[in-house]
Amino acid sequence: MMTGTIETTGNISAEKGGSIILQCHLSSTTAQVTQVNWEQQDQLLAICNADLGWHISPSFKDRVAPGPGLGLTLQSLTVNDTGEYFCIYHTYPDGTYTGRIFLEVLESSVAEHGARFQIP
């Protein structure tokens, strides 16, 4: 039985040209995390394998950095980065847990006056 829950940073906004940390946290389970996959729509951004460490997909190598922790840092943001991001926790013996984050990348002037979501 899957008892765990994923907490995420939820809906976040950031300025074009800036950077943002995508973070998920799995709680309420003793399952072992064997791998975390980070995805954006139809593309794999990164894999963090418990044995092998981080792999950043070639499409994102220049502007994605691993961490902090199991999170992911997106750099040099563009408006095209707006959209849904998913953290997929592969665990044993529970199976797969998925968290969703929506990122909105705003033009600098808009972001300065718009609502901000702070990362805990």
Epitope: L44, I47, W54, H90
Partner: antibody, heavy 120, light 107 residues
């Protein structure tokens, strides 16, 4: 140039154990790669059996979990496969392979393979 | 386990032809797919990683595409030396699994 070479017996009796060695030259098995065992059954089906990582942690295919052991000798730059309770269904060509983690996340080095027959 | 299905066990083509080999995953694997070529009597060789990236030294007639569950490997102009079995493989999660292979036969 990185090279992998499998060695071990070509014939194993049913219920006995298979022991294979993979000798790696041109690259340290403690650097960045996962060192794998893969087998190819008659008829060409490929099965990933498991790996030992550069740090020494292992992961195996659950279908083989109770029978398989992967170990290494860093001083000789070798890693090993032991498969217990062999049956005719384990007759296959056994390959060792290097799984590149940082850039490709794929098996970019393979040994030439060693044929193993299980028969009394 | 994630099952990778290559629906065609054999494909027959002529030198100079364009040929596409398909692979379907039993569940979502994003772009976590590689393609390998195995020539007769040899071990497999990596051609494509991350669904669409050519490995070092691989001729540009070989391309890969797809995401999610459906993937395609294409040879734009088949050469005689492309006679081989081609395998897809997912690395979305362990156990890493391979397709059953598609044998390319040259007419």
């Amino acid at each position: 140039d990185v090279q992998l070479q499998e060695s071990g017996p070509g014939l194993v009796k049913p219920s006995q154990s298979l022991s294979l060695t993979c000798t790696v030259t041109g690259y340290s098995i403690t650097s960045d790669y996962a060192w794998n065992w893969i087998r190819q059954f008659p008829g060409n089906k490929l099965e990933w059996m498991g790996y030992i990582s550069y740090s020494g942690s292992t992961r195996s295919n659950p279908s083989l979990k109770s029978r398989i052991s992967i170990t290494r000798d860093t001083s000789k730059n070798q890693f090993f496969l032991q498969l217990n309770s062999m049956t005719a269904e384990d007759t296959a060509t056994y390959y060792c392979g290097g799984w590149e983690v940082r850039n490709y996340y794929a098996m970019d080095y393979w040994g030439q393979g060693t044929s193993v027959t299980v028969s009394s | 386990d994630i099952v990778m299905t290559q629906s065609h066990k054999f494909m027959s083509t002529s030198v100079g032809d364009r040929v596409s080999i398909t692979c379907k995953a039993s569940q979502h694997v994003s772009t976590a797919v590689a393609w390998y070529q195995q020539k007769p009597g040899q071990s497999p060789k990596l051609l494509i990683y991350s669904a669409s990236y050519r490995y070092t030294g691989v001729p540009d007639r070989f391309t890969g595409s797809g995401s999610g569950t459906d993937f395609t490997f294409t040879i734009s102009s088949v050469q005689a030396e492309d006679l081989a079995v081609y395998y897809c493989q997912q690395h979305y999660n362990t156990p890493w699994t391979f397709g059953g292979g598609t044998k390319l036969e040259i007419k």
